[in-house]
């Protein structure tokens, strides 16, 4: 045997190496892979080192006997029959209240002649059962809203306006955003007096009813 090369690397059961006929000089990298249905145990990558030994022990190929974790599904909880998903294991998905399952609620891990075990179906989805409406918002003081409904369908927009002499602070239009539950895109706006005139005009009754001192205020204004 040559004393300037690493030892020959054998083939492994249920797998192969690449390159299949490597140069055995220092720096050579050999990768082992397994046939479908088998997984590498140990290091799949070996390197011929300066001291002409391989960097790792020879790996082996072990039969895959379980399915991968099918994952969580948003808006659901799942019931698992076995924690490591061996062949025969089941995962049941149960959608949260307000959601409905599309697809298969129960997945089963099946063995296959060739290849790794596989789930009976893809993970399902949990969809909104319905688009709930948004409850009507009251009109701002000294303002109005349109339309004046108690319930607004998801996607609908309501518009706000203010009485003459008042200006809108906030969003003039807000949308009923679909969701669980549906909700308004912004808080309702308020109507503020456009000037002090507006402020006092809106309170003229208060002024009339107020004690004498307030008339000085009014006169000063």
């Amino acid at each position: 045997p040559r004393n300037d090369t690493c030892p020959e690397l054998p083939e492994i059961p249920n797998g192969w190496k690449s390159p299949s006929q490597p140069e055995l000089v220092h720096g050579t990298v050999v990768t082992y892979q397994c046939y479908p249905g088998y997984q590498v145990v140990g290091s799949s990558v070996l390197m011929c080192q300066w001291d002409l030994t391989w960097s790792e022990d020879l790996p082996s190929c072990q039969r895959v006997t379980s399915c991968h974790d099918p994952g969580d599904v948003e808006h659901s909880r799942r019931l698992i029959s076995s924690p490591k998903f061996p062949v025969g294991a089941t995962v049941q998905y149960i959608c949260d209240q307000g959601f409905v399952l599309m697809g298969s609620s129960i997945l089963t891990c099946h063995d296959r002649q060739a290849g790794s075990p596989k789930w009976s179906d893809r993970a399902p989805k949990c969809l909104l059962e319905q688009l709930k409406p948004c409850h009507g918002l009251s009109a701002p003081e000294n303002g109005a809203r349109s339309p004046e409904k108690q319930l607004h369908p998801a996607g609908a927009t309501i518009h706000f306006s203010c009485a003459p002499g008042y200006v809108l602070k906030g969003q003039a239009s807000i949308k009923c955003v679909p969701g669980h539950p549906s909700h308004w895109s912004d808080p309702p706006p308020i109507c503020r007096a456009a000037s002090l005139d507006g402020f006092y005009n809106s309170r003229s009754l208060d002024v009339a009813k107020a004690p004498a001192a307030s008339s000085t205020l009014d006169a000063a204004h």
Epitope: L101, I106, A156
Partner: antibody, heavy 118, light 112 residues
């Protein structure tokens, strides 16, 4: 209100790829628990579901057409795009997009008629 | 795939008279959650389909109460208590319980 509008070519040649766009308003394509679907209807015939795309970008296809279809979305533009390869005269149909939740199509676009002819 | 079969194909009705459309599924469309996702759509001439009934018997928002749905398992019916001229079009049943979702072939309602 929730509205959808389809756009795309009126005429495509056999073997070409069809690209259709659905622009939605009144809801976001990222609204959790919702999806948008494409459905088609050949002239004088029944409706056929083609594909769904969900809020989380998961995609489901009609198995009989899966190899020819690709659905995608651009949430920022509120658009869902369907491409269908290797078009044939039998694919002549009105193509609709619709919201999908509650296991039904609640809101539909007005549809776009696509004719496949050389 | 589940096949949805509708009868009749064509239904001529006098305004004010009742109408009934039948839909049969090739297998049970009861969902794993116990509900049945059987819907009815109406496609008026030159328009896109509109949802009338969902989950067998629930009217969608804005649908007049002359429309009603019933049935279970594999047999379902859409009834119109008094047909109006605006009800003309093609009615489709649809199942969403199982993937892929499938439509019936349609029933054309016309005014006599």
């Amino acid at each position: 209100q929730v509205t959808l509008k389809e756009s795309g070519p009126v005429l495509v040649k056999p073997t070409e790829t069809l690209t259709l766009t659905c622009t939605v308003s009144g809801f976001s394509l990222s609204t959790s628990g919702m999806g948008v679907s494409w459905i088609r209807q050949p002239p004088g015939k029944a409706l056929e579901w083609l594909a769904h795309i969900f809020w989380d970008d998961d995609k489901w296809y009609n198995p009989s057409l899966k190899s020819r279809l690709t659905i995608s979305k651009d949430t920022s533009k509120s658009q869902v795009v369907l491409t269908m390869t290797n078009m044939d005269p039998v694919d002549t149909a009105t193509y609709y997009c619709a919201t999908f939740y509650g296991l039904y199509f609640a809101y539909w676009g007005q549809g776009t008629l696509v004719t496949v002819s050389s | 795939d589940i096949v949805m079969t509708q009868t009749p194909l064509s239904l001529p009705v006098t305004p004010g008279e009742p109408a009934s459309i039948s839909c049969r599924s090739s297998q049970s469309i009861v969902h794993s959650n116990g509900n049945t996702y059987l819907e009815w759509y109406l496609q008026k001439p030159g328009q896109s389909p509109q949802l009338l009934i969902y989950k067998v018997s629930n009217r969608f928002s804005g649908v007049p109460d002359r429309f009603s749905g019933s049935g279970s398992g594999t047999d379902f019916t859409l009834k119109i208590s008094r047909v109006e001229a605006e009800d003309v079009g093609v009615y489709y049943c649809f199942q969403g319980s199982h993937v892929p979702p499938t439509f019936g072939g349609g029933t054309k309602l016309e005014i006599k």
